[in-house]
Interface confidence: low
């Protein structure tokens, strides 16, 4: 059976396509090519007479077509208008005509796309952003990339307009991108330059550092305030409710007890219109605030070595303190079997070994004062040597 095959089937605009013919009958007078799915004289491209080896152009000939003795048709410099069906009619010597129809599709070489956005400075948790991939072209697949990865499945990401528009619902500060769109057709692909979002957010609750509360008279007080914000926050300081200065850092040299009080950092984002404050108490004192003696307790004071575990707990009613542990005048933990938890209030030893026997105590401290617990004695016993497989050691 007479057939035709397009090589290639998908053709890039400006390239060439060859309409190959298979199973061409032996005894022929000639053949003709037509544009379309049927034989139509008004749409004949070319006719070829075998006897004279003469090609004759038809009404639909554009000057870009070449017919070969094997009936194949070459079309050069194709345009999108060339897309469609082509019909070959062969006139056999028995005067029985045979026809075969083939087709090909011409696609444009795609340009480099670009991304347009309805809002390049969205506000976090408030705005939606619609990205559109330009230009709009027919028979084109639109793909999107975020951080060089394909789109994750998320209810906040919505594709529309044939995937040409990507809508990001309720943006967050993590949605900065970069975003890229890629356009594809069967013959070409091109990716846009990356676009980033400038997500306006914050300020978050500011943090004042350092965390110290107690200071000695004569020291320098240097406080720094930071709040995550875009654009960066504007900062101001208040002491005991009275405005001091509009800076991110506050420096007071040679402080006295009169500098004790409430230090407030105020962070403002002029774009979002949001404000956040943090208050820190500063105490300037010669005296060491008395830290009460902590209490130490053990889950058990006599344990079996290599078998039992023990928890030591250091209890204090003071606030704003830190806790450290000591064993035989060495700070803990000293081995992987020792773990501190719950803000260092609990020391866990698992399992207990012979070398863990001895005196333990804890110490609570703040920048100004400290106090130690009474010591507690941990005794470690060992049972008779374990026997393997019920056999006496030999």
């Amino acid at each position: 059976q007479l057939t035709t095959e397009s090589m290639p089937f998908n053709v890039a605009e400006g390239k060439e396509v060859l309409l190959l013919v298979h199973n061409l009958p032996q005894q022929l007078f000639g053949y003709s090519w037509y544009k379309g799915e049927r034989v139509d004289g008004n749409r004949q491209i070319v006719g070829y007479a075998i006897g004279t080896q003469q090609a004759t152009p038809g009404p639909a000939n554009s000057g870009r077509e070449t017919i070969y003795p094997n009936a194949s048709l070459l079309i050069q410099n194709v345009t999108q208008n060339d897309t469609g069906f082509y019909t070959l009619q062969v006139i056999k010597s028995d005067l029985v005509n045979e026809e075969a129809t083939g087709q090909f599709h011409v696609y444009p070489e795609l340009p480099k796309p670009s991304i347009s956005s309805n809002n390049s400075n969205p506000v976090e948790d408030k705005d939606a952003v619609a990205f559109t991939c330009e230009p709009e072209t027919q028979d084109t697949t639109y793909l999107w990339w975020i951080n060089n990865q394909s789109l994750p499945v998320s209810p906040r990401l919505q594709l529309s307009n044939g995937n040409r528009t990507l809508t990001l619902l309720s943006v967050t500060r993590n949605d900065t991108g970069p975003y890229e769109c890629e356009i594809q057709n069967p013959v070409s692909a091109n990716r846009s330059d990356p676009v980033t979002l400038n997500v306006t957010y914050g300020p978050d609750t500011p943090t004042i550092s350092p965390s110290d509360t107690y200071y000695r008279p004569g020291a320098n007080l240097s406080l720094s305030c930071y709040a995550a914000s875009n654009p960066p926050a504007q900062y101001s300081w208040l002491i005991n409710g009275t405005f001091q200065q509009s800076t991110q850092e506050l420096f007071i040299p040679n402080i006295t007890v009169n500098n004790s009080g409430s230090y407030t950092c105020h962070a403002n984002n002029s774009v979002t219109g949001c404000n956040r404050t943090t208050v820190k108490t500063i105490i300037v004192t010669e005296l060491s605030p008395v830290v009460a003696k902590p209490q130490i307790k053990a889950s058990k004071t006599t344990v079996t070595g290599d078998k039992d575990s023990v928890n030591l707990t250091c209890s204090t009613n003071d606030t704003g303190i830190s806790i450290r542990w000591f064993f035989k005048n060495q700070s803990l933990p000293s081995s992987e079997r020792m773990k501190l938890s719950q803000g260092n209030t609990t020391l866990s030893i698992n399992p207990v070994k012979r070398e863990d026997a001895g005196t333990y105590w804890c110490e609570v401290f703040n920048p100004i004062s400290k106090n130690q617990s009474d010591p507690i004695m941990l005794n470690v016993n060992y049972n008779a040597l374990p026997q393997e497989n019920g056999l006496s050691p030999g």
Epitope: D125, K126, D127, A128, V153, S154, P155, R156, Q158, L169, S170
Partner: antibody, heavy 121, light 111 residues
Framework: EVQLLESGGGLVQPGGSLRLSCAAS????????MSWVRQAPGKGLEWVSV????????YYADSVKGRLTISRDNSKNTLYLQMNSLRAEDTAVYYC??????????????WGQGTLVTVSS | QSVLTQPPSASGTPGQRVTISCSGS????????VSWYQQLPGTAPKLLIY???KRPSGVPDRFSGSKSGTSASLAISGLRSEDEADYYC???????????FGGGTKLTVLG
Amino acid sequence: EVQLLESGGGLVQPGGSLRLSCAASGFTFSNYAMSWVRQAPGKGLEWVSVISHGGGSIYYADSVKGRLTISRDNSKNTLYLQMNSLRAEDTAVYYCARDPTKGYAPTFDYWGQGTLVTVSS
Amino acid sequence: QSVLTQPPSASGTPGQRVTISCSGSSSNIGNNYVSWYQQLPGTAPKLLIYADSKRPSGVPDRFSGSKSGTSASLAISGLRSEDEADYYCGAWDVSHNGYVFGGGTKLTVLG
């Protein structure tokens, strides 16, 4: 205590309109996405619509698109559902529900007691 | 016809363990979190499980959720008479751009 209180339900003729309200209290309303979910008598739950906490994102079930409109007034801590061109199949108890995840992992942790909408001639 | 498929009914005796299934597709359960809701007769639904397996505070640990592929399950152990209710699964569906529920499972506590 989180409370969601729907109102505005009642009997309405086919083709008619109704506006449901959901008054929220006990939480910062503007921080939460809100949904309407309905339940026809003796039937299961059917999600109707969701609105993001800022109101910038809205989705509808296909069965109500073009007829029902969700909105919110964060200054009044109130969620609304404007119902137009009502049909008999819109007869249901309408619940408002809160999504605590801002749509990142949609779920409904608090529900109102519901308000009954009956569409009948 | 619900997008998520649940058995219409389930039953068990007090103390038993009962499992309710919920089947979906990659556009919902397969790529999104599943929630489970309990609706006692004449009341509004109550959240039992969210994010596939997490329990809100106040929900007994007798209730547990799990997910594998495009299916999810709710398990109730130590069944009690007060567990008699309708149970619904739900998830976001990216192809519908909306939330979808299962048709609901009526749980009966026998005896």
